[in-house]
């Protein structure tokens, strides 16, 4: 069965910036996908972008890079402008198109732990600092000890007494012992900074594999449209976009004048052609 | 929940007539056309007519002069006219709303179940 897996990040360096994954995992063509947020495509949903294995991306504010990853993946680079953050409580919506076979679409949104309020990388410093001191508070008691036995055998040294050589070859044993564990606790300084991640997400999280990352499939849905094709042609679409209620093609942000429903589309706004001769429509 | 729902399709003889019907409804997307495309047995997929956000229809040669598109603003459906009807026309019928890339095409992300047509005599 068909599968959408959808991976919401924020960028460790930028708390403002966030980053869509999703992927497809099943056989057949894509012929289109669409990411949304606030909900699932034709539910409630806001697209951000679409994409067309052929003809290129579209996006709409605030998505700032839309892009094919492998053949059934992509990701999508959003700029938030807010201070508040909105991206951190919201659902991302991920719809993968196979037509005339169907569509799968499934939602994630981002973990809890890389919320910025409750994020973990400035926790660590104090409780670092705290073994810090205890650890430079101990080498300090091993240092004052071996200082002070040393003053002790060198006391002990200028007296003519005939057991003194022995005692100075214990010195340098006891002395090498004194050390040993100031050692380990430097080694033990050196291992909270080597073993304490920081970074949200792996650095190479987008050269990995789709089946490594966090599939979230909440609201995973499958639409069966159509019957199965033998042929599909992939297929999707640029340029402006109608925002449709309840059925109607209408302007943004303006209601139809009309109490009836209906199809009113709205002026083009879309971009530079993609492909210059492609077989479609005319 | 977005719903295509095709109708009109049939046995008819060549140089027949048929209109197709589709009936949308629980559309809330960002969308930039609607129009037909069809699928022949044993082929592939070939967008026939759509209407783009400028109003304007747009047709593939093979069918321009033949069909007709257009749109009922009070019954929120959109149709299709096909008068001339050739064998080459028999093909599942598909209703589509979609994205534009380019000025003509139209790119399906959300479609119906189809409807049959055959022109045969």
């Known amino acids: 069965t068909p599968e959408v897996w959808v991976q919401v990040q924020m960028e460790a360096t930028e708390l403002s910036s966030f980053t869509v994954h999703c992927g497809f995992l099943g056989p057949g063509s894509i012929s289109l996908v669409t990411v949304s947020w606030g909900g699932p495509d034709g539910a409630g949903g806001t697209k951000l972008a679409v994409l067309h294995p052929e003809l290129g991306t579209r996006q709409w504010a605030p998505a700032r890079q839309a892009r094919w990853e492998t053949q059934s993946s992509i990701s999508l680079a959003l700029e938030d402008s807010g201070a508040s953050s909105p991206f951190a409580n919201t659902t991302f919506c991920c719809k993968f198109a196979s037509f005339p076979e169907g569509s799968w679409e499934s939602c994630g949104s981002l973990p809890p732990s890389s919320d910025p309020g409750l994020s973990a990388p400035p926790t660590p410093v104090p409780i670092l600092r705290a073994d810090l001191a205890g650890i430079l508070g101990l080498s300090g008691v091993l240092l004052f000890g071996c200082g002070y036995l040393l003053h002790l055998l060198r006391r002990q040294k200028h007296r003519p007494t005939p057991r003194l050589q022995p005692s100075h070859t214990n010195s340098q044993a006891l002395t090498a012992q004194a050390w040993a564990p100031s050692q380990a606790s430097q080694a033990a300084l050196h291992d909270p900074y080597a073993t304490i991640n920081t970074s949200f997400c792996p650095a190479t999280l987008d050269t990995a594999h789709p089946n490594g990352w966090a599939s979230l499939p909440t609201h995973a849905a499958h639409q069966p449209q159509g019957p199965a094709a033998s042929a599909s042609t992939p297929i999707l679409a640029r340029g402006s976009f109608v925002s449709v209620e309840n059925g109607l093609y209408t302007q943004a942000g303006e209601r139809p004048p009309h109490t009836g429903p209906g199809l009113t589309l709205f002026p083009d706004c879309r971009g530079p052609r993609a492909v210059e001769g492609r077989f479609g429509v005319r | 929940e977005v719903q295509l729902v095709e109708s009109g399709g049939g046995l008819v003889q060549p140089g027949g007539s048929l209109r197709l019907s589709c009936a949308a409804s629980?559309?809330?997307?960002?969308?930039?056309?609607m129009g037909w495309f069809r699928q022949a047995p044993g082929k592939g997929l070939e967008g026939v007519a759509h209407?783009?956000?400028?109003?304007?229809?747009r047709y593939v040669d093979s069918v321009k002069g033949r069909f007709t598109i257009s749109q009922d603003h009070a019954k929120n459906s959109l149709y299709l006219q096909m008068n001339s009807l050739r064998a080459e026309d028999t093909a599942v019928y598909y209703c589509?709303?979609?994205?534009?890339?380019?000025?003509?095409?139209?790119?399906?992300?959300?479609w119906g179940q189809g409807t049959m047509v055959t022109v045969s005599s």
């Open positions: 629980g559309y809330t997307s960002r969308t930039d056309c």
């Open positions: 589509v709303v979609g994205f534009k890339f380019d000025e003509d095409y139209c790119a399906p992300n959300d």
């Open positions: 209407i783009d956000s400028d109003g304007i229809p």
